[in-house]
Structure formats: structure tokens, C-alpha cells
Interface confidence: low
């Protein structure tokens, strides 16, 4: 079963993604997700989490890194990296700016 939405107090988070309705959002926790799609530069998105807290516990891979935190605007200045591939020269950098 999917994790139910948190009913605890909400935290204000920095929101930076095409889905944001403004520079902040409110959720059960804050998130930063760095995703690398095939043939593209990594995309880093910041926002709020309410479902699937188990994603926060996942280890970084060469394709995705999912970070979570629980305090006011805690995701604001966090920059993530992806797990290095076998060829160090191909390791992508973050693209948060």
C-alpha cells in the first residue's frame, strides 16, 4: 500500500520545479531530487513531500538522488551529486543553478 499522507505539522520548503506555484510550498517534509535522464544533463528539483517517505531512504544511483529534510527551508541550499559511473570522466555535475 502507498504511504498515507502525513497529518503532522507542515514545514515550509523552497520550491523550484516546473510544478511549483510559487517560491515556497508546504508539506510534511522538504525534498531535493536530482534526476538524470538518458542523454540529458541532470535536473535538480526542490519541493515538498507528503507521500512515499521511503524514497528518502534510497541510496543515490547514477540516475537519481533523493534527499529529504524536515526543517524550515532546509532544502534551499542543498546541492546533490549522482553516484559516479565506472568512467570518472563521465560523472555528471549538479545543475542546480
Amino acid at each position: 500500500d502507498p504511504v498515507k499522507p502525513s497529518r503532522g505539522p507542515l514545514v515550509t520548503c523552497t520550491c523550484e520545479s516546473p510544478h511549483c506555484r510559487g517560491p515556497t510550498c508546504q508539506g510534511a517534509w522538504c525534498t531535493v531530487v536530482l534526476v538524470r535522464e538518458e542523454g540529458r544533463h541532470p535536473q535538480e528539483h526542490r519541493g515538498c513531500g507528503n507521500l512515499h517517505r521511503e524514497l528518502c531512504r534510497g541510496r543515490p544511483t547514477e540516475f537519481v538522488n533523493h534527499y529529504c529534510c524536515d526543517s524550515h527551508l532546509c532544502n534551499r541550499n542543498v546541492s546533490l551529486v549522482l553516484e559516479a559511473t565506472q568512467t570518472p570522466s563521465e560523472q555528471p555535475g549538479t545543475d542546480s543553478q
Epitope: 523550484e16 520545479s17 510559487g22 517560491p23 515556497t24 545543475d95
Partner: antibody, heavy 121, light 110 residues
Framework: QLQLQESGPGLVKPSETLSLTCTVS??????????WGWIRQPPGKGLEWIGN???????FYNPSLKSRVTISVDTSKNQFSLKLSSVTAADTAVYYC?????????????WGQGTMVTVSS | QSALTQPPSASGSPGQSVTISCTGT?????????VSWYQQHPGKAPKLMIY???KRPSGVPDRFSGSKSGNTASLTVSGLQAEDEADYYC??????????FGGGTKLTVL
């Protein structure tokens, strides 16, 4: 050093559409930590927020102007634009474009120099 | 959405301190720390002086300070100088898709 430059006609006739463009130089409009905004100032009056846009095209507007405003972004040209329809003399103002920095500052930290638009027949 | 309330004018002699208030609601000033202050000289674009209630951008003199209590934010200019004479505007983020400005305060250095 990032700079913003407004451009567009300085005179618009009543009932027509005001169109302005803001060109971003010295940085990318596609930076994920910035929102891009339009703010205006009628002669002798205060500042009024018109609307903001994200590089993805998500836009949000002042409720009092929402029915007449469209803000769009062209990442290929590093520009974002304002269209205000059905203008009246009350829309005469200096129009500024500005950057909202969501990473370091949490404020409109960089502004264009402004462009005066007069609505008159 | 209503403009934030600022006094139309404020004044002080050189060397004195002046405080300008900016009153909003729990939906804007009271609800977020995204309160900023701008200085505008005649014919010029606004310049950021204070951000996030009390932080100063580099290059802004430490004579300028900001604070907030409840739904009211304040800008204090201490050790007034002639070049501080200008209009000052506050602004606040006001929820998921709105920003709101104050009506502006004309600061006169006597």
C-alpha cells in the same frame, strides 16, 4: 553580472494590448533558482506587482490584473514578455522587469532600468 | 490582495535614526520571512536594501537594518545621511502565487 533590459513601445492606444519584453544578459533565464517578474509604477505612485514566471512557463499573476495579463518566457532568446490587454490611462506607468532570487536572497534582487509606457490616443 | 501599509512620509536630521513600518496580515508579512525593502531615488529603478526581513546585501551600509514583529515589518536607518533621502518600499511574498508591495514612504533628511 546579470542584467535585465526592458523593451517595447512607449505609447499604446486605449483598448489595445501593451507588449513588453525583458532580455536577460549575463546569465541564463533557465536557471532553476530564479523567478522572473514584472512590476509597474504609475507616475507619482507606488510599486505594483504584476506577475512572475518560472523558466518552465508556469506563471502567476496579481489577482487584480489576472484577466488582462499574460506573461510568457522564451528560453531560446533568454527573454520573458508581458502582455496587458484592454489598456486604459490607468495603465500608464514605468514597467520594470526583475529577478526573484529563490536561492540566496529571497527577494527581487536585480531590476531593469524600467521603461515608460503611456496609454493615450 | 491589499497593499501593505506604510506611512506616506518620514523624516529625520543627519545623524539621527528613522524607522519606517510596513504592516500586512498573517497571510503575507506575518506568514513568511520573505519581506524585503527597496530604496528608490527619483527616476531610478528600485534597489534592494534588506531581504528576508533583516539581511543586508553586500554593498548596503550597516546603517540599514530590518526587523519584524507579528504582521509588521520595520526598516531602520541610523546615522541618517543626505543620500538616504529617497522613497522606500517594502514587499512580501503572500502565499502560493502572490507578491504584494507597500505604498511607499518618502524619507526626507532635514
Amino acid at each position: 553580472q546579470l542584467q535585465l533590459q526592458e523593451s517595447g513601445p512607449g505609447l499604446v492606444k486605449p483598448s489595445e494590448t501593451l507588449s513588453l519584453t525583458c532580455t536577460v544578459s549575463g546569465g541564463s533565464i533557465s536557471s532553476r533558482s530564479y523567478y522572473w517578474g514584472w512590476i509597474r509604477q504609475p507616475p507619482g505612485k507606488g510599486l505594483e506587482w504584476i506577475g512572475n514566471i518560472y523558466y518552465s512557463g508556469s506563471a502567476f499573476y496579481n489577482p487584480s490584473l489576472k484577466s488582462r495579463v499574460t506573461i510568457s518566457v522564451d528560453t531560446s532568446k533568454n527573454q520573458f514578455s508581458l502582455k496587458l490587454s484592454s489598456v486604459t490611462a490607468a495603465d500608464t506607468a514605468v514597467y520594470y522587469c526583475a529577478r526573484w532570487d529563490n536561492w540566496d536572497v529571497g527577494a527581487f534582487d536585480i531590476w531593469g532600468q524600467g521603461t515608460m509606457v503611456t496609454v493615450s490616443s | 490582495q491589499s497593499a501593505l501599509t506604510q506611512p506616506p512620509s518620514a523624516s529625520g536630521s543627519p545623524g539621527q535614526s528613522v524607522t519606517i513600518s510596513c504592516t500586512g496580515t498573517s497571510s503575507d508579512v506575518g506568514g513568511y520571512n520573505y519581506v524585503s525593502w527597496y530604496q528608490q531615488h527619483p527616476g531610478k529603478a528600485p534597489k534592494l536594501m534588506i531581504y528576508e526581513v533583516s539581511k543586508r546585501p553586500s554593498g548596503v551600509p550597516d546603517r540599514f537594518s530590518g526587523s519584524k514583529s507579528g504582521n509588521t515589518a520595520s526598516l531602520t536607518v541610523s546615522g541618517l545621511q543626505a543620500e538616504d533621502e529617497a522613497d522606500y518600499y517594502c514587499t512580501s511574498f503572500a502565499g502560493s502565487n502572490n507578491w504584494v508591495f507597500g505604498g511607499g514612504t518618502k524619507l526626507t533628511v532635514l
